[in-house]
């Protein structure tokens, strides 16, 4: 429980202003009324409070809003946002992109990835889906933040906004997120010509299934090795040596550099050594000639 002290009459706070920077922690606790603070939140960020003083102000707001802050307060948090935990943010309901922008700006340069991820999640929930305006805000103010959303949230992304997503926005996306985004991208770019389509779909290919990779191998796309290394292991394993060669084109030589790394290493283990030898790259670890490959998973599925 909080240790209660009485506010000295001469320290009574009638408005939130610069005089408060001279208040000790105990004086702020005793003299600043949370309801007054909330009503004058727009003044707080202009006052150079110490981190200790900001802690007190946060606790005051927590006292007033045990179920989470209303957006009228969140909008004006400013540097107080740096004091928020993901658990605090999870209680919020945020719909305004102005609020999102303001807090993304504050978080820049601070280690707040968990808080930002939770904030974006609350915005998506508050707005009902990740609409184009939200996506545009994220790409402008927080490149890479799109990938902080859970696959469940990303599932609400309409294909129409995929075109606004830049390759760098997907750099930190994991396989589960790309699994969700890839079908949307495929739908969004389906009417584009081969080369244009590949440029657009490339950042999303970490979510592509084997059959789509096989189809791409027939289109002379010359996939760079960085993209290949981000493909799903399960999608790459069934590809033949010839298909990988066609998929990578002149970049096939890069397989030698990556032969110890997944998915290249796992793919090599699945190929016949004599097929690998046709590449002339000296890749080792394939199935020796004369060995019979039994796919037990197929037999299990049949029984």
């Amino acid at each position: 429980d909080v240790e209660r002290t009485t506010c000295p009459p001469e320290k009574e706070v009638h408005e939130i202003d610069e005089s408060l920077i001279f208040y000790k922690k105990r004086e702020l606790e005793a003299c600043v009324d949370a309801a007054l603070l909330a009503a004058q939140m727009d003044r707080v960020d202009a006052i150079p409070f110490t981190y200790e003083q900001l802690d007190v102000l946060k606790h005051k707001l927590d006292e007033l809003y045990p179920q989470g802050y209303p957006e009228s307060v969140i909008r004006h948090l400013g540097h107080l946002f740096l004091k928020m935990s993901p658990e605090d943010i999870r209680k919020w309901n945020v719909t305004s992109l102005e609020t999102l922008k303001a807090l993304l700006k504050v978080s820049k340069g601070h280690e707040m990835s968990a808080q930002v991820a939770t904030l974006i999640d609350r915005v998506v929930v508050g707005r009902g889906q990740l609409d184009k305006d939200t996506a545009d805000t994220l790409t402008a103010f927080c490149p890479g933040c799109l990938c902080s959303l859970s696959p469940e949230r990303l599932s609400s992304v309409p294909p129409s906004i995929i075109g606004a997503v830049r390759p760098q926005d997907l750099d930190t996306c994991g396989p589960r997120q790309l699994d969700v985004l890839y079908p949307k991208a495929r739908l969004a770019f389906q009417n584009m010509s081969g080369s244009e389509y590949f440029v657009k779909i490339r950042p999303f290919l970490g979510g592509a299934p084997t059959e789509d990779l096989k189809a791409l191998s027939q289109q002379n796309v010359s996939m760079d090795l960085a993209t290949f290394m981000k493909l799903r292991r399960e999608a790459v394993l069934p590809l033949s040596v010839a298909e990988v060669q066609k998929l990578l084109g002149p970049h096939v030589e890069g397989l030698k550099v990556e032969e110890q790394h997944s998915p290249v290493r796992d793919w090599i283990l699945k190929q016949r050594q004599d097929d690998l030898d046709t590449l002339g790259l000296g890749l080792q670890g394939g199935i020796p000639n004369g060995y019979l490959i039994l796919d037990l998973s197929v037999r299990e599925a049949l029984s």
């Epitope: 429980d1 909080v2 209660r4 506010c7 009638h14 408005e15 606790e29 005793a30 003299c31 600043v32 009324d33 949370a34 309801a35 007054l36 909330a38 009503a39 004058q40 606790h59 005051k60 006292e63 007033l64 809003y65 045990p66 179920q67 209303p70 009228s72």
Partner: antibody
């Protein structure tokens, strides 16, 4: 169901003291701002005081500052108003009310207790 | 302190008529912090409108609030017999949290 029940009102002489109580139930008292509002006979409402739930930060109307003290006992879900140096103009029905920080206003009120200051 | 002035002092109207009550503040009040209450004789006040325009739980939609800055309005679109009462505005923008002096809506 939210309930606020005031008690402690009565007749008191000028200069005397009285302590009002307000028993709260049906909501999380320990998380809620509470207020006292009064109404003199035939007159309008006058905000008297409020108190925060955790830090017990207090605020008062100028007319009662230095004479009245608001307090709370969170373990008993009870709000108090200690009234000292009472004057004839303090005669009123005193209401205890719950402050809703989300729907900003006094959303639940007690039935009131009458304080009469007279010689 | 913020002084709230309500007008008119008394409004004499018939059931079914529209009532328009005014609340003027001596200095600007954030609309989030303006509330309206209804009080009937012998009863405690009841919160009608918060945030200048949002109806409190259980309040019929014939009650509506509007305004910003220093001028706020409570409107009752069609007066029902149970609406004849005294109405108060209150600001929570700064301390003390003052009330207006009230507007009595009486049957004509």
């Amino acid at each position: 169901e939210v309930q606020l029940l005031e008690s402690g009102g009565g007749l008191v002489q000028p200069g005397g003291s009285l302590r009002l109580s307000c028993a709260a139930s049906g909501f999380t008292f320990t998380q809620t701002y509470m207020s006292w509002v009064r109404q003199a006979p035939g007159k309008g409402l006058e905000w008297v005081s409020n108190i925060s739930p955790t830090y017990s930060t207090t605020n008062y109307a100028d007319s009662v500052k230095g004479r009245f003290t608001i307090s709370r006992d969170n373990s008993k879900n009870t709000l108090y108003l200690q009234m000292n140096s009472l004057r004839a103009e303090d005669t009123a029905v005193y209401y205890c009310a719950r402050y809703n920080a989300y729907q900003i206003g006094l959303d639940y009120w007690g039935q009131g207790t009458l304080v009469t200051v007279s010689s | 302190e913020i002084v709230l002035t309500q007008s008119p002092g008394t409004l004499s109207l018939s059931p079914g008529e529209r009532a328009t009550l005014s609340c003027r503040a001596s200095q600007s009040v954030s609309s989030s912090y303006l509330a309206w209450y209804q009080q009937k004789p012998g009863q405690a006040p009841r919160l009608l409108i918060y945030g200048a325009s949002s109806r409190a739980t259980g309040i019929p939609d014939r009650f509506s609030g509007s305004g910003s800055g220093t001028d706020f309005t409570l409107t009752i679109s069609r007066l029902e017999p149970e609406d004849f009462a005294v109405y108060y505005c209150q600001q929570h923008n700064q301390y003390p949290n003052t009330f207006g002096q009230g507007t009595k809506v009486e049957i004509k």
